[in-house]
């Protein structure tokens, strides 16, 4: 199917009709889906509009609005999605098409197929020349109970229309037997729960039809409710993954389509990223671009989203200085600086020469989520309160590609600092180290600084800071948890490294093995929270003996083989079916008997759930994914 | 006692390149910084460029960057500065200068060393 | 062409209170700090003031200096005959990467 993209311009067009029609046609033009809306507007009445019958599915909503052409040629449109409203409320809305001077305007709907319109109400008013729009039975075609007042369609503009052909019984889009209304769906009988294709029980479309069939299979449908996959309607497309029974985990489906639209693709287009098993044009603002086997994907961010920015003296901050008041907002959600990062008294306390205000020392924290500087850090100015940089406590990697008198880290001459906590600083790529002058500063003597670098001519020079007998004298050391490679500052968050265990970043005497509110696990010198799917054990009992859902104790709620689950798995995709499993006394979880297509209560096929014409348009996973 | 004694008086000919020694004594040579700054006769000081010998790297201004070379030998504790291509703009009293690191002042110099250049 | 500008030249009679400005920019002067330097005639410069206002030690607190913005001033006070000499402001370039130095001053005691 060729796809297009739709457009969300609502009323507003371009100042030169010919062009909005150009626009129009080059958009629609052998199109067959439009992914998005459909909007026609301000188009004159002598022109040619043939090339809109390649249109068969609007996914969003269409808008017919400002024209004064005749006649509407959707004659293939068979489904509008509703997916977005106009006016979050229509998903047609056909106004205003006649000229207000003279005598053109819309005279007739050529919607023949229009037979599902899945969500949103519609609107059909103020066409002075329509006719025929006031006799379709819109209830048939639209899916959802809309209330009346979603569904509001005058009647006819024109004195001067004709009636229905008599074979249409009073139903239709034009004059003659072509164009009839095919009802679909209140011309059923009443145990279809969907469309139909005769007034007979054995008429049913099946359940995953929109629109109408040709037949009772998902492949005699004229669209789909949800997904085509090569030809046949189905709720979902083959998963990602699929439950496999014998290991009780979610394995990777080497079947797995992806959603495209309303169909089921095996790749997405070129321009396009997976995420989650569906092709989007970008990731969300919480995921990132990651290029997995050749193919393009958002990956959930573990905290902040990779963000490169400019530094100081780099693309949009080439003429800076400094980091100032004028400037600090552009390093909102950065996680890597391309250039520098130079603080200088100008930047900290402002510049009323060049009206720029001192930095507002909270702004500061902008830099918390820096992870990355390629090239250098120079602070020769901070502000006085602030008695740390742990603004930079994120840093990790401090590149060196760009060097200022061939230094990458250079701390000049600031007094009210104590201590620099780096806490997350590994590596300095290239470059030299100055730390000079800082008369307070304390705790860098307690660091070896040459397990920074990446180079064998890298230096040092830390001079004339406090004395590291001074600091020592005020108590001002590493924290009793720290091991002897030293820290960045006091507490125990600081440390290079712990001398018994570690939680996060933070250094501890033990594990919560057998008590505290999370319990934990040890892995090396690492505390590792249990499972959430572990059951809290009392004091004095471990919760779990590894990772994973499979080394709890006990199941905090349900045992699926070896693994402890939220819920047995109801309607999991499997390898050629769906997977059901019902819980037993001991909460352990069983499997359905084969006859069971929608779940069940125990083991046998009497204990099947039954849930009349309905299907399961959103399967949960609750199973492991290796 | 702090100091900086520089190497003697040199006549050149336009093109040729000079190289003035600095043998510093009385503090620890390798972490502090050490510039050249020179005066044409009758004019004001001018930075030419500067070593700290631990990060082995010059620093140079950008008017004399290529011409130019500023190299220690820690195992000295001398400093040295060579000039290229050298003109008659260039005669000037070379001083060299110490400085407790990058951005500090000069707080010790030498005694100054004259090149003439002429043909 | 200096990027930091002096007088070329002030003059004060014994005993009086002199002033020597100095004027850059906020990549020097604003944003670093500031020191002077003392030439008498046939010698070496001698650093008089460093960190804007700092005496080192055995500099007579006649001479005085303070910053303000991108702008330096050297007052020099109860002038003596042995105070004639080129005075030079310096700072260092954060844009350049260099050590730049004013035109210098010559002060002339009458």
């Known amino acids: 199917q060729s796809v297009c993209a739709g457009t969300e311009n609502k009323l507003s067009s371009l100042s030169d009709l010919e062009q909005q029609y150009r626009a129009l046609r080059k958009y629609y033009e052998n199109c067959e889906v439009v992914m998005g809306n459909l909007e026609i507007t301000s188009i004159e009445h002598n022109r040619d509009l043939s090339f809109l019958r390649s249109v068969r599915e609007v996914t969003g909503y269409v808008l017919v609005a400002l024209n004064q052409f005749r006649y509407l040629p959707l004659e293939n449109l068979r489904i509008i999605r509703g997916t977005k409203l106009y006016e979050d409320r229509y998903a047609l809305a056909i106004f205003l098409n006649y000229r207000k001077d003279g005598n053109f305007g819309l005279q007739e709907l050529g919607l023949k197929n229009l037979t599902e319109i899945l969500n949103g109400g519609v609107y059909v008013d103020q066409n002075k020349f329509l006719c025929y729009a006031d006799t379709i039975h819109w209830q048939d075609i639209v899916r959802n109970p809309w209330p009346s007042n979603l569904t509001l369609v005058s009647t006819n503009g024109s004195s001067g229309c004709g009636r229905c052909h008599k074979s249409c019984t009073g139903r239709c889009w034009g004059p003659t037997e072509n164009h009839c209304q095919t009802l679909t769906r209140t011309v059923c009988a009443e145990q279809c729960d969907g469309r139909c294709y005769g007034p007979y029980v054995s008429d049913c479309c099946h359940r995953e039809c929109a629109g109408g069939c040709s037949g009772p299979k998902d492949t005699d449908c004229f669209a789909c409710m949800n997904f085509n996959d090569s030809g046949a309607c189905v709720t979902q497309c083959p998963q990602t993954f699929v439950y496999n029974p014998t290991t009780f985990q979610l394995e990777h489906n080497f079947n797995a389509k992806y959603t495209y639209g309303a169909f089921c693709v095996k790749k997405c287009p070129h321009n396009f990223v997976v995420d989650s098993s569906s092709c989007v044009r970008a990731c969300p603002s919480s995921k990132m671009e990651v290029e997995e086997n050749g193919i393009k994907m958002c990956k959930p961010c573990t905290d902040i989203c990779p963000k490169a920015c400019d530094g100081i003296g780099t693309g949009s901050l080439m003429s800076a200085q400094t980091v100032d008041s004028s400037n600090i907002d552009k390093f909102i959600n950065c996680t890597k600086i391309n250039g520098n990062l130079i603080f200088l008294v100008t930047g900290i306390h402002g510049d009323p020469y060049n009206a720029i205000e001192a930095i507002d020392p909270e702004k500061l924290n902008v830099f918390r989520t820096v992870r990355e500087i390629t090239g250098f850090l120079n602070i020769q100015s901070w502000p006085p309160n602030m008695t740390d940089f742990s603004v930079f406590s994120n840093l990790v990697t401090i590149g060196g590609r760009v060097l200022y008198s061939g230094l990458s880290l250079l701390i000049l001459k600031q007094q009210g600092i104590t201590s620099l906590q780096f806490q997350s600083l590994k590596e300095i790529s290239a470059g030299n180290i100055y730390i000079t002058d800082n008369s307070n500063l304390c705790y860098y003597h307690t660091i070896n600084w040459t397990t920074l670098f990446s180079t064998i001519n890298q230096r040092i020079v830390i001079r004339d800071n406090r004395k590291a007998e001074n600091c020592t004298a005020e108590g001002m050391v590493c924290n009793h948890l720290c091991s002897s490679d030293g820290c960045w500052g006091p507490g125990p968050d600081q440390c290079l490294s712990c001398r018994r265990f570690s939680r996060g970043r933070i250094c501890i005497e033990s594990c919560n093995l057998y008590d505290g509110e999370f319990r934990e696990f040890e892995n090396g010198s690492i505390c590792v929270e249990c499972d959430p799917q572990c059951e809290k054990m009392e004091d004095g009992l471990l919760t779990c003996h590894g990772p994973g859902p499979d080394n709890c104790t006990k199941c905090s709620h349900f045992k699926d083989g070896p693994n402890c689950v939220e819920k047995c798995p109801d309607g999991l995709q499997g390898a050629n079916s769906f997977i059901f499993k019902y819980a037993d006394p001991d909460r352990e979880c069983h499997p359905c008997h084969p006859n069971c297509t929608q779940g069940c209560n125990g083991p046998t096929s009497h204990d099947c759930i039954y849930y009349p014409w309905t299907g399961h348009s959103t399967l949960p996973q609750h199973a492991r994914t290796p | 006692e702090v100091q900086l004694v520089q190497s003697g008086a040199e006549v050149k000919k336009p093109g040729a390149s000079v190289k003035v020694s600095c043998k510093a004594s009385?503090?620890?040579?390798?972490?502090?910084?050490i510039s050249w700054v020179r005066q044409a006769p009758g004019q004001g000081l001018e930075w030419m460029g500067g070593i700290i010998p631990i990060f082995g790297t010059a620093n140079y201004a950008q008017k004399f960057q290529g011409r130019v070379t500023i190299t220690a030998d820690t195992s000295t504790s001398t400093v040295y500065m060579e000039l290229s291509s050298l003109r008659s703009e260039d005669t000037a009293v070379y001083f060299c200068?110490?400085?407790?690191?990058?951005?500090?002042?000069?707080?010790?110099w030498g005694q100054g060393t004259l090149v003439t250049v002429s043909s | 062409q200096s990027v930091v500008t002096q007088p070329p030249s002030v003059s004060a009679a014994p005993g009086q209170k002199v002033t020597i400005s100095c004027s850059g920019s906020?990549?020097?002067?604003?944003?670093?700090?500031v020191s002077w330097y003392q030439q008498l005639p046939g010698t070496a410069p001698k650093l008089l003031i460093y960190d804007n206002n700092k005496r080192p030690s055995g500099i007579p607190d006649r001479f005085s200096a303070s910053k303000s913005g991108t702008s330096a001033t050297l007052d020099i006070t109860g002038l003596q005959t042995g105070d004639e000499a080129h005075y030079y402001c310096g700072a260092w370039d954060s844009s350049l990467s260099v050590a730049v130095f004013g035109g210098g001053t010559k002060l002339t005691v009458l």
């Open positions: 200068a110490r400085s407790r690191g990058y951005y500090d002042p000069f707080d010790v």
């Open positions: 009385g503090y620890t040579f390798t972490s502090y910084g």
């Open positions: 906020s990549s020097n002067i604003g944003n670093n700090y």
